[in-house]
């Protein structure tokens, strides 16, 4: 399929050679001739510069499972719809789809050949890690907890008596051993109660009772004696 292109405009002057930049389209190969250059066109193309396609869908131009669309006759162009993982006018090129950096928010891209997966960082989800799970917007902390953002993450600051990621779990107020100096902790509907060991008093049994009967507190609440349970609200 060689086509000789005449030296229309002094193309053979002392400047660059006529094949510089390869004037042949669609994969045609260029060779210099005494008068100019000629293009040797691949199957299915013709014209001075291989610019005309004679390929139709009947020629099966789409590779790797590509579907030929249009191109019912030589005068209408065809296009190939390529399966995921392939590209090019004939689906002839395998795509490194991860090079397009499709995973957002620092997600790790995995090209499995037939499919692409994003392994998301903690706090992100979705096919492309596009959903920010650590955003307080629209996120409710249950049982009166408040959402606190920070460091790309969110957490719930829970009201007394509740715990867990969303404050949905009833917390054991005694789990942290809040009663000092050997005081015994009792869970209570409104919090906890400390029963202090002899010699200590206060909501958390944190104050020693002085030997003369006076405590380290400025003034003991009326009606409470050392050793009485102290309700912590």
């Amino acid at each position: 399929y060689p086509y000789d292109v005449p030296d229309y405009a002094g193309m053979l002057g002392s400047g660059p050679g006529p094949c510089d930049g390869n004037p042949c389209a669609n994969g045609g190969s260029c060779s210099e001739t005494p008068r100019s250059f000629e293009c040797t066109c691949p199957r299915g193309f013709y014209g001075l510069r291989c610019e005309v396609s004679g390929v139709t869908c009947a020629d099966g131009p789409c590779f790797n499972g590509g579907l030929c669309v249009g191109g019912a006759d030589p005068d209408s162009a065809y296009i190939c719809h390529c399966p995921p993982g392939f590209q090019g006018s004939n689906c002839e090129k395998r795509v490194d789809r991860c090079s397009l950096q499709p995973c957002r928010n620092g997600g790790l891209c995995l090209d499995l050949g037939h499919a692409l997966r994003c392994r998301c960082r903690a706090g992100f989800a979705g096919p492309r890690c596009e959903h920010d799970l650590d955003d307080c917007a629209g996120r409710a902390c249950a049982n009166g907890g408040t959402c606190v953002e920070g460091g790309g993450a969110h957490r719930c600051s829970c009201a007394l008596g509740f715990g867990g990621r969303d404050c949905r779990e009833r917390a054991d107020p005694c789990a942290a051993r809040p009663c000092a100096h050997g005081g015994r902790c009792y869970a209570h509907f409104s919090g906890l109660v400390c029963a202090c060991a002899p010699g200590y008093m206060g909501a958390r049994c944190e104050f020693p009772v002085h030997p003369d009967g006076a405590s380290a507190l400025p003034a003991a609440p009326p009606g409470l004696r050392p050793g009485d349970p102290q309700r912590y609200l």
Epitope: D59, C62, G65, L67, C68, P83, G85, G126
Partner: antibody
Framework: QVQLQESGPGLVKPSETLSLTCTVS????????WSWIRQPPGKGLEWIAY???????NYNPSLKSRVTISLDTSKNQFSLQLSSVTAADAAVYYC????????????WGQGTMVTVSS | EIVLTQSPGTLSLSPGERATLSCRAS???????LAWYQQNPGQAPRLLIY???SRATGIPDRFSGSGSGTDFTLTISRLEPEDFAVYYC?????????FGGGTKVEIK
């Protein structure tokens, strides 16, 4: 294994628009082409359209003037709209996943029957 | 568009027998881009064969496909009770994607 579920009204009036949605059970909607196929009662299969998340679409020429296919990656859903329906559009409508190697269909929804009647 | 004609329309056979189904295209199917499906009553089709001869995942080896150009064949070497169904061919080389009219394999 991924599952597909069609949803939409089972009864549509003549001249109105049929709207169907297909929900994909996992996050693979960006990895495949997705398609709609229909089957009139007692008859064979007819391909309607397909779509890819990049925006590529393709329609059956016999239906192209009346069909729109769309995709919502955030909801893992794709949808079909068929306007100006007639009794000839009554069929079981299937959504399907396009096979990763060529435009065959490897995963199908269970289908939803659409009746056209006033 | 490429028209696919399946024959016979109905095939009456007994379990254990060999079934041979034909799919003929009105023009060449490029690159053997042809698939076969099985459909049981009230169910969605199931992909059996792609690329004219490759079995899809989980398909028993009693199913085999062959052919190229315009003539394709699906063979079921020994019919099992669950194989009695309708079979469709589909070409996916040229848009629009088209299906054959189907062959019903029924119990004799």
């Amino acid at each position: 294994q991924v599952q597909l579920q069609e949803s939409g009204p089972g009864l549509v009036k003549p001249s109105e628009t049929l709207s169907l949605t297909c929900t994909v059970s996992d996050n693979s909607i960006s990895n495949y082409y997705w398609s709609w196929i229909r089957q009139p009662p007692g008859k064979g299969l007819e391909w309607i359209a397909y779509i890819y998340y990049s925006g590529t679409t393709n329609y059956n020429p016999s239906l192209k003037s009346r069909v729109t296919i769309s995709l919502d990656t955030s909801k893992n859903q794709f949808s079909l709209q068929l306007s100006s329906v007639t009794a000839a559009d009554a069929a079981v409508y299937y959504c399907a996943r396009v096979f990763h190697w060529g435009f065959a269909f490897d995963i199908w929804g269970q289908g939803t029957m659409v009746t056209v009647s006033s | 568009e490429i028209v696919l004609t399946q024959s016979p329309g109905t095939l009456s056979l007994s379990p254990g027998e060999r079934a041979t189904l034909s799919c003929r295209a009105s023009q060449r199917v490029s690159n053997t881009y042809l698939a076969w499906y099985q459909q049981n009553p009230g169910q969605a089709p199931r992909l059996l064969i792609y690329g004219a001869s490759s079995r899809a995942t989980g398909i028993p080896d009693r199913f085999s496909g062959s052919g190229s150009g315009t003539d394709f064949t699906l063979t079921i070497s020994r019919l099992e009770p669950e194989d009695f169904a309708v079979y469709y061919c589909q070409q996916y080389g040229t848009s629009p994607l088209t299906f054959g009219g189907g062959t019903k394999v029924e119990i004799k």
